[in-house]
């Protein structure tokens, strides 16, 4: 009710609480000389529900029975309304709608570690919408009770603030929780638990471990755990890995073993806690160790490869190419690569360390049998040492990979295919396919990519260093013992017509016809692979079409001949390119005069 | 044990505005109403607005239209915000919170719509 209400009273009956779905009769009514003046058969009483009128009356009470109300507080005011004057407010009264508690369900206790205090949740089942008080009740031995009452309005957790000892393990203890609201109450079905079905033991702690000899072989991992612990889980895994590797253990006392562990290898290492083999609950998850095992010596090859480049009557320039070891293999930090140049016949050899690249060139005489052996170095060793005998790789003719092609094959790969060479495609021991960007002045600076593929392959899907609107020289080399067979192509990705065209820079007279000479064009505006330059020439101020000649693009040509010219006449000449996709704009323009005799 | 502080009250003009303010403690808040009242020294205290847990609100026919009020149940607040204003309307604004156990008022705080 509206505290001190000095017009009238508003009374609600049976209560002011009432049940989901129940009627209650409200009552409004003026307290004496509190009416309109003059005339009480005048006054008007009305009854609001909220700020919504719902009834009214002429007198000195009004009666009202109201059903339907919705879950929680509704407030009814009542107001009289007299002749000539604004409503005034007599009196007001809430009503509050709820439920019964339901039965508390799922009541569970844990005491978390040995020290810790015995605490209970539950499931409070559907709101109530009334002030709810729950009460919490453990027995155990020897008529022993303690009781816990909660005052928050969403009550599902309670905690004792005792702790249970191991003293006696197997004694029953018995917790419940009861729910109590104007409306009504409900306990929980009683939960009877043992200390040892409770504990849930603290996670372990202090985490540590050590490799015996910095070896990862003699692994061992430490942990501090409660007294009465029995049991332990470990996981692991790599740093980089979802997956868990996991182990169980029966009384550990705080270490473990562990032999499956890569070397070289960040590990995140964790650790929970149990007291007994089939009662009671795992502990959480210990905070995770973080640890990098020791480093082995390498295992596996290096894949290497070499180009071979003639300098004179008697050097020539020998580039070694070596892949980085995967990190399974390298087992460590690579240090340095140690390569070995040896000549077959005279037994010289010669050792370098190589530190921050793959690649090694040095220039060796033309004559003796040649071999290298490559390998990689860490803190603990060395790889086996790859060992290739240096030959002239497209020597063999017969060996030559036939009807090589190369197709664009979606975003930034190409698919390279062949047929196997005339020779005896059977003594074909492995096929080297090998790319670089292509520069016109055949720069050995430029990156070189391979991959092998076996012998019964007759293709193979580059992708790696591939960029668009780029021209690779692709390479497919057959290899047969000490011999070996190439064929070459040109491949792009993806092409488009080339941004410009030839720049002319010279024409010559030459007995009668000129000799056109031209720059490349740069090699980001070439949009892939030439196919054919074409000349174009017309006498200077005449309307007639041009005439031109195609000329197949080859990396090294820059100059051409045209012979088809008359003497003593302008001519304008310009030049463009040709890839798949199209042709380049024109070049720049020049003019030229062949000065010759006429016929 | 709920606790309610009124603040934002003062002297205004007519056809001015104030924000009034209450914040409530304890948990039980949650489930119900805040209502505004208001009192004018010598006469009872009159409901001027209600609002539910869900954030529907009811107004008396006096102060419809020109009052709206709000709540926010994450920092236990009530809001009373008054346009508008009337010399009528000056009093001590309280609030409340009504439960089936009783109901909880704060100390009020003063509303003076005077030119």
């Known amino acids: 009710k509206i505290d001190a209400c000095k017009r009238g009273d508003v009374t609600v009956k049976p209560s002011h609480v009432i049940l989901l779905g129940s009627t209650v009769n409200i009552t409004c009514s003026l307290k004496p000389r509190q009416g309109c003046f003059h005339y009480s058969r005048r006054n008007k009483l009305i009854l609001y529900k909220f700020d919504r009128r719902i009834n009214f009356h002429h007198g000195h009470s009004l009666n009202s029975q109201v059903t339907g109300l919705p879950l929680g507080t509704t407030l009814f005011v009542c107001k009289l309304a007299c002749i000539n004057s604004d409503e005034i407010q007599i009196c007001g009264a809430e009503i509050f709608v709820g439920v019964a508690p339901e039965q508390p369900q799922n009541l569970s206790c844990i005491q978390k570690g040995e020290q810790g205090t015995v605490a209970c949740t539950w499931e409070r089942g559907r709101d109530t919408h009334l002030y709810t008080e729950y009460t919490l009740q453990l027995s155990g031995p020897k008529n022993l009770t303690w009781q816990k009452q909660c005052k928050d309005i969403y009550c599902d957790y309670l905690d004792f603030g005792i702790n249970l000892t191991p003293e006696s393990p197997e004694s029953n203890f018995t917790a419940k929780v009861t729910a109590v609201n104007s409306l009504g109450s409900s306990s929980s079905l009683p939960s009877t638990f043992t200390f040892l079905d409770i504990v849930r033991p603290l996670p372990p702690w202090d985490i540590r471990i050590k490799f015996q000899k910095a070896s990862v072989s003699r692994c061992t991992l430490y942990w501090r755990d409660e007294g009465l612990v029995l049991l332990n889980r470990l996981r692991y895994r790599p740093s980089n890995s979802r997956l868990w590797n996991m182990v169980n253990v029966t009384k550990a006392k705080g270490r473990h073993d562990l032999l499956d562990l890569k070397p070289f290898t960040e590990y995140e290492f964790q650790i929970s806690s149990k007291l007994h083999l089939y009662k009671g609950s795992w502990s959480d998850w210990s905070e995770s160790l973080r640890a990098q095992t020791p480093e082995e010596e390498p295992t596996g090859m290096l894949d290497v490869w070499y180009m071979k480049r003639h300098i004179d009557y008697s050097r020539q320039q020998i580039s070694l190419f070596w892949k980085n070891l995967s990190v399974s293999e390298a087992r460590g930090k690579i240090l340095h690569y140690q390569v070995t140049l040896q000549e077959l016949t005279g037994g010289k050899a010669m050792t370098q360390n190589i530190t921050g690249h793959t690649s090694w060139t040095t220039v060796i005489p033309r004559t003796g049998n040649w071999a290298v052996a490559v390998s990689a170095a860490n803190s603990k060793g060395s790889s086996l040492p790859t060992r290739i005998n240096i030959m002239n790789l497209c020597e063999a003719g017969l060996l030559a990979p036939r009807q090589v092609s190369a197709n664009s094959e979606g975003m930034d790969n190409i698919l390279v295919t062949w047929q196997p060479p005339r020779k005896d495609p059977s003594a074909v021991q492995e096929y080297v396919v090998e790319w670089r960007e292509l520069h016109p002045g055949g720069d050995t600076q430029v990156p070189l990519n391979w991959l092998r593929s076996r012998p019964y392959n007759v293709s193979a899907l580059i992708s790696e260093n591939i960029k668009s609107y780029i021209c690779y020289e692709i390479r497919v080399y057959a290899l047969s013992g000490d011999q070996g067979g190439c064929s070459s192509i040109l491949g792009n990705s993806k092409h488009k017509a080339p941004l410009s065209g030839p720049h002319i820079n010279a024409i010559t007279e030459e007995k009668g016809s000129i000799l056109i000479s031209w720059n490349s064009i740069p090699v980001q505006e070439q949009m892939g692979c030439l196919l054919h330059y074409r000349i174009y020439w017309k006498e200077r101020d005449s309307n007639s079409q041009p005439q031109l000649c195609e000329i197949p693009y080859r990396v090294s040509q820059n100059s051409h001949p045209i012979n088809s010219l008359q003497p003593r006449v302008t001519y304008v000449l310009w030049m463009t390119a040709l890839t798949a996709a199209g042709e380049s704009s024109h070049g720049n323009e020049r003019e030229f005069c062949l000065q010759g005799k006429a016929n | 044990q709920v606790q309610l502080q009124e603040s934002g009250g003062g002297l205004v003009q007519p056809g001015g505005s104030l924000r009034l303010s209450c914040t409530a403690s304890?948990?039980?808040?949650?489930?119900?109403?805040m209502d505004w009242y208001r009192q004018v020294p010598g006469n009872q205290r009159e409901w001027v607005a209600s609002?539910?847990?869900?954030?529907?609100?009811y107004y008396d026919g006096s102060v419809k239209g020109r009052f709206t009020i709000s709540r926010d149940n994450a920092k236990m607040m009530v809001y009373l915000q008054m346009n508008s204003l009337k010399p009528e309307d000056t009093a001590v604004y309280y609030c409340?919170?009504?439960?089936?156990?009783?109901?909880?008022w704060g100390q009020g705080t003063q509303v003076t719509v005077s030119s």
């Open positions: 409340k919170v009504p439960t089936e156990k009783g109901n909880y």
């Open positions: 304890g948990s039980i808040l949650s489930i119900y109403n």
């Open positions: 609002i539910t847990p869900s954030g529907d609100p």
